[in-house]
């Protein structure tokens, strides 16, 4: 074994560093010390460390080891801050053009149906955003509503334009009439169908992103354990109470102290594996009925299709629609 | 037919136009994502190196600090003597992960779950009951246009119109992102760096 | 330590192929993207494409589509580029070079391995 | 694509001085920029990622700052093994790298 260099007789280079740590130099000895209070750094001879230098270093290493952790993310964690972000803007930059598609849909072809139309698309869409968002809504009784809310329109201002005004209160009466007639044919539910699907698709990729952004803050500002602080403090700091201000620590005994403080959060390394190989499967699988952004911008297009339905069956429809709904203010239909 | 707003469409041949190559469209962009994710796979299991690599280690040193004395770099002491009477490396890793790293392995354990139940098994996009429901199976085979189901003129392509990035309101800085102002500098009176 | 150890200089005639090898050490071969970078007598370097092992996903710069093909064999930690319909612009120093693990940016490069093309 | 203009494409300094070379992205690269050092016969030598994170083993001589599009590398008190070619790299879509700067001391 080499011999020991010769022990720093004043502690003087020990004081120097310790004062850029710690401005003040009441904590450390004049010359070496027994240092029989040292709980972390146990002398083998005398020491140029106090117990108050000894928190001190536990304190500093711990911060170290914040710093480090912070910095191995840094590059990951704006990746996924930023990516949540943009895909959460462009999520909402699809409903509004959806939306927008919808009601320039109406407003050329149905202009009839204009002022009703546009607040009954302008609800559904806004339901959709709050569903991507996270919000408890149904989205079949998203779709549904919207049909219900449209047939009655529909009903007294196309197919049968020339009704009184006294007949208007008929509504809830069409609206159940719109789902047992099946009057949209399979519109809706194919409608429903895309829909559902898509959003749903959409609305756990953005969850997964949020939480990939706790997972890394978790990491981030763990708070380690007083054990890892103390094995931290003998590995980076004790050599300095010996006066080796140069010598660095062997790397294989990093390494056993590294996985000793890190041992909880290297479990985290399976499910983070997993987390980023189920994304990518998620994400390969967003396309088609699968891709919000396929769908949505779609929509105007297969709504305006069921409309043209009804049309091509509006002689059939109001017939019957015309015994049905007859007496509506003595009996609700439903 | 319907009307196509102007900006997105001339009339309905307009989408069987081929898609556009270049096009920034979001699903580029999530897979854009997944390649850069895929980056960091062994981000938790290379922490500890990472640590190490960024702290002072004897590298070309003949001698080291094993964590009670000075010691020759390949000696076998340079590993184990710092640990002895001192504290149970064993003990430490037993005690288990801290219970906030518990709580955020349960919720990626949920999340991962939801994702393998969500995911599309390859060729199952259109699932079975909505063929039965007034879907036609067209010449849907592009990878690059999206099919959407209608009904009177058949399947109809739908271009992914999103050049988003164009589109985003706007420009999104890191500094403006919440919790992103970690960058390692210590407070004035507290030297945290080391010292080579 | 990480290390990439590239195959050794090769001599071609042009419209001939060749395949460039990079053996990885000291890693996880297979979570690490592997790339491939050009350098020609006297240029600066051009990123030609790299490769995923774990799943053999590729990117490829829109120039070298056609001219390179990447793969990999995981049993060996071996990655290969093989460049074909070669001609005397192929000439140059090829590297491969990891994508990082903290960062995406390429953190280990191989030694480079110099292609010449002539008849 | 992305470009990287890459400048000067060669400068002179004297020993113990400092230089700095700059790269402009064709568009924003949101802090993914690299920078590397390469020497003949040698692969390139990883210096800093991500603008301003240097890498283990590189002495904070060298710096690196930016944001947005426009980027910088510096680097303070020169010595003589700093002779080499300097890259710049961008890595937020795919990659592509600067010309390179090749730096002579006087």
């Known amino acids: 074994q080499p011999p020991p260099p010769p022990p720093d007789a004043t502690c003087h280079q020990v004081r120097s560093f310790f004062q850029r740590l710690q401005p003040g130099l009441k904590w450390v000895p004049e010359t070496p010390v027994p240092g029989s209070d040292l709980q972390v750094c146990l002398p083998k001879g005398p020491t140029c460390c106090s117990r108050k230098m000894e928190e001190k270093y536990q304190l500093t290493a711990r911060l170290n080891m914040e710093q480090l952790l912070q910095s191995a993310s840094m590059e990951l964690k704006f990746l996924i801050i930023q990516n949540a972000a943009v895909f959460q803007e462009a999520f909402e930059i699809v409903v509004r053009h959806a939306k927008n598609y919808t009601n320039a849909m109406f407003k050329n072809n149905y202009p009839s149906l204009t002022p009703q139309a546009f607040e009954f698309v302008g609800e559904f869409f806004t339901d959709v955003s709050l569903y991507i968002l996270g919000s408890d809504i149904n989205v079949d009784d998203m779709v549904n509503e919207l049909f219900d809310s449209l047939f009655p329109v529909i009903y007294t201002q196309l197919m049968n334009p020339g009704l009184p005004d006294s007949a208007l209160d008929i509504n809830e009466c069409l609206r159940g009439a719109r789902r047992d007639l099946k009057v949209f044919g399979n519109f809706p539910k194919l409608i429903m169908t895309q829909v559902s699907k898509s959003l749903q698709v959409t609305r756990i990729f953005l969850q997964a992103l949020n939480l990939g952004i706790e997972v890394i803050n978790t990491t981030d500002h763990l708070k380690f354990s007083k054990d890892c602080g103390r094995m931290l403090t003998r590995m980076w700091y004790c050599s300095y109470c010996q006066g080796l201000m140069m010598v660095k620590p062997c790397g294989g005994y990093c390494n056993v102290v590294m996985q000793g403080c890190m041992a909880g959060v290297v479990e985290i390394d399976k499910y983070w594996r997993e987390y980023i190989l189920s994304l990518e499967e998620l994400v390969n699988g967003m396309y088609r009925i699968y891709d919000m952004e396929n769908v949505l911008l779609g929509l105007f297009s297969t709504i305006h299709d069921s409309i043209q339905y009804v049309q091509k069956n509006a002689g059939k429809l109001t017939t019957t629609i015309g015994k049905l709904c007859a007496h509506s203010q003595q009996r609700q239909y439903r | 037919s319907a009307y196509y707003p102007e900006d997105l469409f001339i009339d309905k041949k307009v989408l069987k136009v081929a898609h556009v190559e270049h096009e920034e469209t979001l699903s580029s962009r999530r897979r854009e994502l997944i390649q850069k994710l895929k980056s960091f796979i062994s981000f938790y299991s290379a922490l500890p190196g990472y640590i190490c690599s960024h702290s002072p280690v004897a590298e070309n040193d003949t001698l080291c600090w094993n964590g009670q004395e000075l010691v020759e770099r390949y000696s076998q002491k340079a590993a184990r003597n710092g640990m002895k009477n001192q504290f149970n490396l064993h003990e430490l890793k037993m005690k288990g992960p801290e219970p906030v790293v518990s709580q955020i392995i349960d919720k990626l354990k949920h999340i991962n779950q939801l994702l393998r139940t969500m995911s599309v098994p390859k060729g199952r996009v259109l699932d079975k009951n909505l063929d039965e429901e007034g879907f036609e199976s067209g010449d849907c085979g592009d990878d690059e246009d999206e099919c959407i189901g209608g009904s009177g003129d058949g399947m109809m392509k739908v271009k992914n119109q999103l050049r988003f990035l164009a589109e985003l309101a706007y420009d999104l800085d890191v500094d403006d992102v919440p919790g992103n102002n970690q960058q390692a500098t210590p407070k004035d009176n507290e030297i945290s760096t080391f010292h080579n | 330590q990480v290390q990439l150890q590239q195959s050794g200089p090769e001599l071609v005639k042009p419209g001939a192929s060749v395949k460039i090898s990079c053996k990885a050490s000291?890693?996880?071969?297979?979570?690490?993207?592997m790339n491939w970078v050009k350098q020609r007598p006297g240029k600066g370097l051009e990123w030609i494409g790299r490769?995923?092992?774990?799943?053999?996903?590729?990117n490829y710069n829109g120039r070298f589509k056609g001219k390179a093909t990447l793969t990999v064999d995981k049993s060996s930690s071996t990655a290969y580029m093989q460049l074909s319909s070669l001609t005397s612009e192929d000439s140059a120093v090829y590297f491969c070079?990891?994508?990082?693990?903290?960062?995406?940016?390429?953190?280990?490069w191989g030694q480079g391995t110099t292609l010449t093309v002539s008849s | 694509d992305i470009q990287m203009t890459q400048s000067p494409s060669s400068l002179s300094a004297s020993l113990g001085g400092k230089v700095t070379i700059t790269c402009k992205a064709s568009?924003?690269?949101?802090?993914?920029i690299a920078w590397y050092q390469h020497k003949p016969g040698k692969g390139p030598r990883l210096l800093i990622h991500?603008?301003?994170t240097l890498q283990p083993g590189i002495p904070s001589r060298f710096s690196g700052s930016g944001s947005g599009r426009d980027y910088s590398f510096s680097i303070s008190n020169l010595e003589p093994e700093d002779i080499a070619t300097y890259y710049c790299?961008?890595?937020?879509?795919?990659?592509?790298f600067g010309g390179g700067t090749k730096l002579e001391i006087k």
């Open positions: 070079a990891r994508g990082g693990v903290f960062t995406m940016a390429l953190d280990h």
């Open positions: 000291g890693y996880a071969f297979s979570s690490s993207w």
């Open positions: 490769i995923y092992p774990g799943d053999g996903d590729t």
């Open positions: 568009q924003d690269i949101n802090k993914y």
């Open positions: 991500y603008t301003s």
């Open positions: 790299l961008q890595y937020d879509n795919l990659f592509t």
